[in-house]
Amino acid sequence: EGSEREENVEKEGLCNACAWRQNTRYSRIEAIKIQILSKLRLETAPNISKDAIRQLLPRAPPLRELIDQYDVQRDDSSDGSLEDDDYHATTETIITMPTESDFLMQADGKPKCCFFKFSSKIQYNKVVKAQLWIYLRPVKTPTTVFVQILRLIKPMKDGTRYTGIRSLKLDMSPGTGIWQSIDVKTVLQNWLKQPESNLGIEIKALDENGHDLAVTFPGPGEDGLNPFLEVKVTDTPKRSRR
Amino acid sequence: EGSEREENVEKEGLCNACAWRQNTRYSRIEAIKIQILSKLRLETAPNISKDAIRQLLPRAPPLRELIDQYDVQRDDSSDGSLEDDDYHATTETIITMPTESDFLMQADGKPKCCFFKFSSKIQYNKVVKAQLWIYLRPVKTPTTVFVQILRLIKPMKDGTRYTGIRSLKLDMSPGTGIWQSIDVKTVLQNWLKQPESNLGIEIKALDENGHDLAVTFPGPGEDGLNPFLEVKVTDTPKRSRR
Amino acid sequence: DFGLDCDEHSTESRCCRYPLTVDFEAFGWDWIIAPKRYKANYCSGECEFVFLQKYPHTHLVHQANPRGSAGPCCTPTKMSPINMLYFNGKEQIIYGKIPAMVVDRCGCS
Amino acid sequence: DFGLDCDEHSTESRCCRYPLTVDFEAFGWDWIIAPKRYKANYCSGECEFVFLQKYPHTHLVHQANPRGSAGPCCTPTKMSPINMLYFNGKEQIIYGKIPAMVVDRCGCS
C-alpha cells in the first residue's frame, strides 16, 4: 500500500511539473502575441476568419511567392544583436485590396472597380515598386486582349473623367486565366503625394469581342482573383541611442 | 516506507513543475499577444473571422508572393541588438481592399468600385511600389480585353468626372480568369499628398462585346477576387533614446 | 559571445536557450498568413556566479547586496527578426520584418 | 556575449532561453495571415552571481544594496524582429516587420 502511495505521489509530481511547464509556456506565448500586436502597431488582432482569408487572399504569384519565400525558420545572415534592432515591424510589401468609393458608381448604383485606400504612413519616395495585379479570365479561343488601366480624375470641362495609366495588348490562348501585373509606381507615388488625386481607377481588359476579362468583382469560384496592388517599399531605419 | 514517501514527494514536485510550466507558458503567450497588439498599434485584436478572411483575402499573386516570400522565421542581416530596438512594427507592404464611398454611387444608390481609404500615416515619399490588382473573369473564346483604370475627380465644368490612370490591351484565351496588376504608384502618391483628391477609381475591362470582365464586386464563388491595392513602402524609423 | 542551448529534456539548470514554437494557427491568428508558426525560443535557467554573463561587473553589485537579491536574470542576449505576411485589418496584406522575435542566445543580465 | 539555450526538459535552473512558439491560430488570431505561428522564445531562470549577465555591474549595485533587492533578472539581451502579414481591421492587409518579437538571447539584468 505504501509503495502505491509513493507511486501516486510521483505521478502527481510529474503532473504538476507538466502543468507548470504548460502554464509558463502559455504565458510566454501570450506575451509574444501581445508583443507581435504591439510591434505591428495593432491594438487588437485583426478579426478575420480563415474562410474570409481564403476568399480575400489573392490567388496570385506574388502571394505564393511571399508564402514560399521563407522556411519555417530562416536565418538571413543576420547577427541579430540587440543593439541595432528596431522594435516595430518594418513593412516591405503591402498588398492592397480595393475598397469601395462613392465616386466609383455605375449608373445602376453598383460600385465600380477600383479604389485603393492608402495609409499616409507610406512615403512616396520609399516606394520601390508598385504593381497592379489583375486576373484575366480564361478564354475559349485564342484572342487578343486590350488591357486598359484608367485613373479617375475630377471631371474636366470636356467631361473627361478618366486619364489613362497604362494600356497593353496581350495574346491569350484557351485554358486557364492569367495574372497580369501593371507598373503603377508613378501613379501610386502621385497618389501618395496628393492623396486627394486618388479617386480610383478603372480596369478594362477587353477581348476582340469586347468582353471584359478582368476580374474586378469576383464571380462564383473567383475568390482571390480580385485586382490588388503590390507595393514594395524600402526601409532605412534610423539608429538611436537608448 | 521513508523511501516511498520521498519518492511520492519527488513525483508531486514534478507534477507541480509541469503545471507551473504550463501556467507560465500561458502568461508568456498572453504577454506576447499584448505586445504584438501594442507593436502593431492595435488596441484590440481585429475582429475578423476566418470566413471573413477567406472572403477578403485576395487570391492574387502578390498574396501568394507575400506568403511564400519568407520562411516561418527569417533573419535578414539584422544585428538585432537590444539597445537600438524600436518598439512598433514597421510596415513594408499594405494590401488595401476597397471600401464604400459616398462619391462612388450608381444611379440606383448602389456603391461603385472602387474607393481605397488610406491611413494618413502612409507618406507619399515612402511608397516604393503601388499596384492595383484586378481579377478578370474567364472568357469563353479568345478575346481582346481593354482594361481601363480611371480616377474619379471632382466634376469639372465640362462634366468630366474621371481621368484615366492606365489603359492596357490584353489578349485573353479561354480558361480560368487572370489577375492583372497595374502600377498606380504615382496616383497613390498623389492621393497621399492630397487626400481630398482620392475620390475613387473605376475599373473597366471590356471584351470585344463590351462585357466587363473585371471582378469589382465578387459574386458567388468570387471571394478573394476583389480588386485591391498592394503598396510597398519603405520605412525610416527614427531612433530614440530610451 | 555564446549561450547554452537546451530542450525540455535537458538537465541543465543554468541560463539556457530553450525552444519555443509560436504557432499562430494554434491560437487562431488566421490573419497572419505566413509564417503559420515560428521558433521564438526563450531564456530560462539560473544565473549563478559569472556563468554566461555579458557584463560580469553585475556580480560585484550582487556581492555588495547579499540579502534579497534574486541575482542576475537569464534573458536574451541575441535576438533576430522574422518576416511576416499578415492582414492588417484594413483591406491590406502586409509583408514585413518584425525585429527581435526570435531568441538566438540567452544570457544572465 | 552569450547565453544558454534550454528546452522544457532541461534541468538548467539558471537564466536560459527557452523555446516558445506563439501560435496565432491556436488563440484565434485569424487576422494574422502570416506567420500562423512563430518562435518567440523566452528568458527564464535564476540570476545568481554573474551567470549570463549582460551588465555585470548590476552585481556591485546589489552588493551595495542588500535589502529589498530582487537581484538581476533573467531577461532578453538580444531580440530580433518578425515579419508579419495581417489584417489591420481597416480594410487593409499589412506586411511589415515587428521588432523585438523573438528572444535571441537572454541575460540577467
Epitope: 482569408i53 487572399l57 514560399d68 490562348s173 486557364t176 | 499573386p61 501568394r64 511564400d68 480560368t176 | - | -
Partner: antibody, heavy 119, light 110 residues
C-alpha cells in the same frame, strides 16, 4: 497558342551536369511561375523546384546544392541545371506553368523529356 | 520531410461505379487548402483536375470532385468512365517553398 517544351540531352553520364531548357510560348515569364517535376520510369511524380515570376527559386530538399534554376524572360526560356548526376536521377523531366498545389498551377505541362543517366 | 500518402495503391472498379481516392499529408497543407489532384495516363504529362482541394479545374468533367482540409483529402469520381483509367496524384503546398506529391493511386477499369 500557350505551350511549354522541354529540351536537352537524352543521355548524361554519372557525375556530369544536366542542363534542360523549358521554352514557353504564349506565357509571360514575368507574371508566371514555372515548376519542374520529374518522374522516374514506372514511378510517381516528384517535385524538383520552382522559379517564380519574380525570379525567386525554391528547390526540393534533395535537390539543394545540386540544382540551379534560371530564366531568360526575353527568350521565353527557363533553364534547369543539375550537377553530379546519378543513375537514380534517370527520369522524365517536365516543366509546368504555375506551381502544382497552388491555385490552378500545373494547368499546363510540357510533354516531358526523358533523361537517362548511364555510363 | 513531408510525406504524402495515397491510398489505395490500386483501385479496380467497373464503369459507373464510384471511386474514392485518399490522400493524407504528414503535415497540414498551407491554409488547409493548398492541395491539387492530377490525372496521368501512360506516356502523357499530368493533367490538373482539382485545385484548392475542391475547385474543379477548367474543362474537367463534373463527375470529378475534391474534398478535405488540412491533412486529409479525397478525390471522388462519381461514376467511372473507361477514359478515367489512369494514375491519380495529389500535390500539396506547405509554404516556405515546400511542395510534395503523393505516390499515386492507379485506377483500373474492370
Amino acid at each position: 497558342q500557350v505551350t511549354l517544351k522541354e529540351s536537352g540531352p537524352v543521355l548524361v553520364k554519372p557525375t556530369e551536369t544536366l542542363t534542360l531548357t523549358c521554352t514557353v510560348s504564349g506565357i509571360d515569364l514575368s507574371h508566371t511561375d514555372i515548376s519542374w517535376v520529374r518522374q522516374a520510369p514506372g514511378k510517381g511524380l516528384e517535385w524538383v523546384g520552382i522559379i517564380s515570376y519574380a525570379g525567386s527559386k525554391y528547390k526540393a530538399s534533395w535537390a539543394k546544392g545540386r540544382l540551379t534554376i534560371s530564366k531568360d524572360t526575353s527568350k521565353n526560356q527557363v533553364v534547369l541545371t543539375m550537377t553530379n548526376m546519378d543513375p537514380v536521377d534517370t527520369a522524365t523531366y517536365y516543366c509546368a506553368r504555375g506551381v502544382p498545389a497552388y491555385s490552378h498551377g500545373g494547368d499546363l505541362w510540357g510533354q516531358g523529356t526523358l533523361v537517362t543517366v548511364s555510363s | 520531410d513531408i510525406v504524402m500518402t495515397q491510398s489505395p495503391a490500386t483501385l479496380s472498379l467497373s464503369p459507373g461505379e464510384r471511386a474514392t481516392l485518399s490522400c493524407t499529408s504528414s503535415q497540414s497543407v498551407y491554409h488547409a487548402n493548398w492541395l491539387s489532384w492530377f490525372q496521368q495516363k501512360p506516356g502523357q504529362p499530368p493533367k490538373l483536375l482539382i485545385y484548392w482541394a475542391s475547385t474543379l479545374a477548367y474543362g474537367v468533367p463534373s463527375r470529378f470532385s475534391g474534398s478535405g482540409s488540412g491533412t486529409d483529402f479525397t478525390l471522388t469520381i462519381s461514376s467511372l468512365q473507361p477514359e478515367d483509367a489512369a494514375t491519380y496524384y495529389c500535390a500539396g503546398g506547405y509554404g516556405g517553398g515546400r511542395y510534395a506529391f503523393g505516390q499515386g493511386t492507379k485506377v483500373e477499369i474492370k
